[in-house]
């Protein structure tokens, strides 16, 4: 019997009946054995077939068999009810070998030409299975030339049998106080050949409770206890199970904080598995009773290990632990059934003693020393010398622990000095230079720093003076010795002030006339206002009406007197304002350069002379009484004049302050 080609030779070829294409002889038997490589099969088809037809092909036939299985017995030319001819059919081996047998009997009624067939090896697609057959692979099947391989979905691993997918279902640890776990793919059938381990691990003090829910279906056996697939539950105390079958197991109260669940499956079966809902319990803590003026959140029927509650106080109350204030309070239930922190108190908010008000005082309205929530206090400024700025002074203790004004401000009110107060009443007549009395010129400032000069207090920390008086100290403000509250130039009983900064008008040019002869000194501390130290007012817009020609102004200072010495006591003189053109004309003639008197100056004095300010008075204020407000304001600053003070036909020249209000206000607001 001729053998077909053997692998690894190319597996393809032609088979034909003996004598083909001529007729075949009687009593012939031919056998071909074709072998393909592993993973391949053989395909065979006929291009010519002409054999004697007989009942069940008993006489002449071609038989195709693969292993022990006969694939076909063929005869005739066309198929009948009981006989089969190949026609256009293609035949496939079941494995990698195909046997072809040709036989003719002892006679033929007429000549038959036999057959011609072609064969070839082709890849078997192992992944294609007939309906009703078990799939080649559990999950994914991949065909390739000469074979196939299986792979698994995420979460599975290929079993060593290379076909089954075992679940990667070990090492899951559940740490929440409750949860659910189930067999892989639940409620779909669980995977084969798998070993699953689940751990529930709660903090010490908790006890795990297991409830089987929904359905339970694990492969079982009528006689042997769970021989195929099983579920076991292990704690540090005992083991529960194995469980299998279709009945939901009862609740398991483990009395343990750690549980290990093991689920093992074999290679067969089609069951949906199981689902467990677990909860936990612990020793409850005492029910928290909220402190007065507080409430507990969240409200629960009971509180066990790890449960917590917070205390929130009503508006106007704050949390206190002992004497210490708390931003928040949360207590946690411990494993021994006690809370980790003692209950705090909700204590009424205490704003504490109110801050002292500089130049003012505070009065308790609600009650003496009462500083708790909703308590009211009233600030007021020291009468006569101070007034409260844009505030009614009423403050309430609010829930945030701050004293708060009716406008919602938490800062203190401001006591502003009252300006322009004087003990002096002005008369209509002009008197000669006179000694000032206490309280007459409480704004008067003595400036020592190389020379003797003067200034006027503005607010409680500024001094208005002449630029020429402090020009030398503009870069060394600390060199200025500033004294106030005294009438005597040489008295040790003065209030000392020190300069923080000197601001000279940018339009002033030293030794080139006296235009813009104005400067401000910022004091490094506020001075205390009293009857001897009071600021002068700045002129209102309407002030010009009190500074017309012949209106009386008052100049004061310790400058040179008629005797040619600096005055020991503060002196003052009442002098009328001089017509501007008249004054300009007075200083047009030599030795004065043209244009000495500018629009930024005003002049005052007597045509006959004798009443004037002099050297040492520089920077002092020429003041006027505002009859509407009954307050004194600064109209001029002692600036310059004739070489001989009080000379007839010459006048004292003063910086016109009203022209500089924006400059003054800008400096003070900026610094």
């Amino acid at each position: 019997t001729p053998l077909g080609p053997k692998w690894p030779e190319p597996v393809f070829g032609r088979l034909a009946s003996p004598g083909f294409p001529g007729e075949y002889a009687n009593d012939q038997e031919r056998r071909w054995t074709l072998t393909a490589p592993p993973g391949y099969r053989l395909r065979l088809y006929f291009t010519h077939f002409d054999l004697e037809l007989s009942h069940l092909c008993e006489y002449d036939f071609v038989k195709l068999s693969s292993g022990a299985k006969v694939l076909a017995t063929l005869c005739g030319q066309e198929s009948t009810d009981t006989e089969r001819a190949p026609g256009k059919d293609t035949f496939y081996s079941l494995g990698s070998s195909l046997d072809i047998t040709f036989r003719s009997d002892y006679s033929n009624e007429k000549p038959f030409t036999g057959f011609e067939a072609f064969y070839a090896a082709e890849d078997i697609d192992e992944c294609q299975v007939a309906p009703g057959e078990a799939p080649t692979c559990d999950h994914h099947c991949h065909n390739h030339l000469g074979g196939f391989y299986c792979s698994c979905r995420a979460g599975y691993v290929l079993h060593r049998n290379k076909r089954t997918c075992s679940a990667l279902c070990s090492g899951q640890v559940f740490t929440q106080r409750s949860g659910e776990l189930s067999s892989p793919e639940y409620p779909r059938p669980y995977p084969k050949l798998s070993s699953c381990t689940y751990s529930i691990s709660l903090e010490e003090g908790f006890s795990v409770i297991l409830d089987f829910v929904e359905s339970f279906d694990v492969e079982t056996h009528p006689e042997t206890l769970c021989p195929y697939d099983f579920l076991k539950i292990q704690t540090d105390r005992e083991e529960h199970g194995p469980f299998c079958g279709k009945t939901l197991p009862h609740r398991i109260e483990t009395k343990s904080n750690t549980v290990t669940i093991t689920f093992v499956t074999d290679e067969s079966g089609d069951h949906t598995g199981w689902k467990i809902h677990y909860t936990s319990t612990a020793q409850p803590c005492p029910y928290p009773m909220a402190p007065p003026n507080g409430h507990v959140s969240p409200v629960q029927a009971k509180y066990i290990l790890k449960d917590s509650f917070s205390i929130f106080c009503e508006t106007g109350y704050e949390l206190l632990q002992g004497h210490l204030p708390l931003k928040s309070f949360t207590a946690v239930c411990q494993k021994d059934g006690s809370w980790d922190r003692p209950m705090p108190a909700c204590s009424i908010v205490d704003c504490g003693p109110p801050d002292d008000l500089p130049s003012g005082r505070v009065e308790y309205i609600t009650g003496p020393g009462v500083t708790t929530y909703k308590a009211v206090i009233q600030y007021s400024c020291e009468e006569t010398f101070y007034t409260m700025k844009v505030n009614d002074g009423k403050y309430v203790c609010e829930a945030d622990g701050f004293w708060t004004s009716s406008k919602g401000e938490k800062s203190l009110p401001v006591c502003e000095p009252v300006c322009g107060l004087s003990a002096r009443t002005t008369g209509g007549r002009i008197y000669g230079g006179q000694k000032a009395k206490p309280g007459d010129f409480p704004w008067q400032v003595l400036i020592l720093g190389g020379t003797t000069a003067a200034g006027a207090l503005l607010y409680d920390n500024w001094v208005l003076t002449a630029a020429h008086a402090v020009y030398e100290q503009k870069h060394d403000a600390s060199a200025l010795d500033i004294r106030m509250g005294t009438l005597k130039r040489l008295s040790p009983h003065y209030t000392q002030a020190w300069s923080e900064a000197v601001f000279i008008h940018e339009g002033y040019t030293h030794d080139a006339g006296f235009d813009n002869d104005i400067a401000l000194i910022k004091l490094n501390n506020k001075v205390v206002i009293n009857s001897n130290i009071t600021p002068i007012c700045l002129p209102r817009k309407e002030a010009e009406s009190f500074m017309r020609t012949d209106d009386i102004g008052t100049a004061s200072g310790w400058g040179l007197t008629q005797r040619g010495f600096l005055a020991r006591n503060l002196m003052y003189v009442d002098i009328p304002i001089v017509d501007h053109q008249k004054c300009t004309a007075a200083y047009e003639k030599p030795p004065y350069p043209r244009g000495s008197v500018t629009a930024n100056m005003l002049c005052a004095g007597l045509e006959s002379g004798g009443k004037d300010s002099c050297r040492g008075d520089s920077g002092g204020a020429l003041v006027f009484l505002d009859s509407e407000t009954e307050r004194w304001f600064v109209g001029g600053i002692v600036s310059w004049g004739s070489m001989n003070c009080g000379e007839a036909g010459q006048y004292g020249v003063y910086t016109k302050v009203i022209n500089y209000i924006p400059w003054i206000e800008n400096i003070i607001s900026d610094f």
């Epitope: 010795d481 005597k488 040489l490 008295s491 040790p492 009983h493 003065y494 020991r568």
Partner: antibody
Framework: QVQLQQPGAELVRPGSSVKLSCKAS????????MHWVRQRPIQGLEWIGD????????YYNQKFKDKATLTVDKSSSTAYMHLSSLTSEDSAVYYC??????????????WGTGTTVTVSS | QIVLTQSPVIMSASPGEKVTITCSAS?????MYWYQQKPGSSPRLLIY???NLASGVPVRFSGSGSGTSNSLTISRMEAEDAATYYC?????????FGAGTKLELK
């Protein structure tokens, strides 16, 4: 030269009073403030008060307000301090001192010789 | 009132040695003044306005400081410098003195 002359000692009975003098020479008396300072045995210096001789303007340390009275006699260029209701606590050396007028006016450039007051029965 | 605390209360120094006496004020002062007093004599002005030397005072004496901390320094101690030294202020009413530092010759 500038001098402030004081009597060396005064012995007085408890409850009585004493008037201490300080005679100035060598300068214009009315141009300088006159101060008085107490020094008790083994203790520091305490300022009592001062007076302007030109117009008798006076300032006292509150501690001595009811104890001391300051006056001047311009004609004799003498300053006085009257101490009343004396007790052993008032036993001390009492100095007059001239106030400086060149700078801050708040210190003493010339000191008197001091009078030792002993209050004893 | 402003309290002036002098330190040390008592000290001794050898001739030629540098000596420093400090005066601490309970609140800031503008100027400090220093006086020397020898037994049986009246006080004598040494330093005015913190650092200025009074007339007739040897240049080995100097003053320095500001605010609440001031000091008197003798650059080289001499036998005639053995005395009690007082600091004084009048930035705040009433005028006050320190309790004194007794300097002895070693």
């Amino acid at each position: 030269q500038v001098q402030l002359q004081q009597p060396g000692a005064e012995l007085v009975r408890p409850g009585s009073s004493v008037k201490l003098s300080c005679k100035a020479s060598g300068y214009t008396f009315t141009n300088y403030w006159m101060h008085w300072v107490r020094q008790r045995p083994i203790q520091g210096l305490e300022w009592i008060g001062d007076i302007d001789p030109s117009d008798s303007e006076i300032y006292y340390n509150q501690k001595f307000k009811d104890k001391a009275t300051l006056t001047v006699d311009k004609s004799s260029s003498t300053a006085y301090m009257h101490l009343s209701s004396l007790t052993s606590e008032d036993s001390a050396v009492y100095y007059c001192a001239r106030g400086d007028i060149t700078t801050t006016l708040r210190y003493f450039d010339v000191w008197g010789t001091g009078t030792t007051v002993t209050v004893s029965s | 009132q402003i309290v002036l605390t002098q330190s040390p209360v008592i000290m001794s120094a050898s001739p030629g040695e540098k000596v420093t006496i400090t005066c601490s004020a309970s609140s800031s002062v503008s100027y400090m003044y220093w006086y020397q007093q020898k037994p049986g004599s009246s006080p004598r002005l040494l330093i005015y306005d913190t650092s200025n030397l009074a007339s007739g005072v040897p240049v080995r004496f100097s003053g320095s400081g500001s605010g609440t901390s001031n000091s008197l320094t003798i650059s080289r101690m001499e036998a005639e410098d053995a005395a009690t030294y007082y600091c004084q202020q009048w930035s705040s009413y009433p005028l006050t003195f320190g309790a004194g530092t007794k300097l002895e010759l070693k």
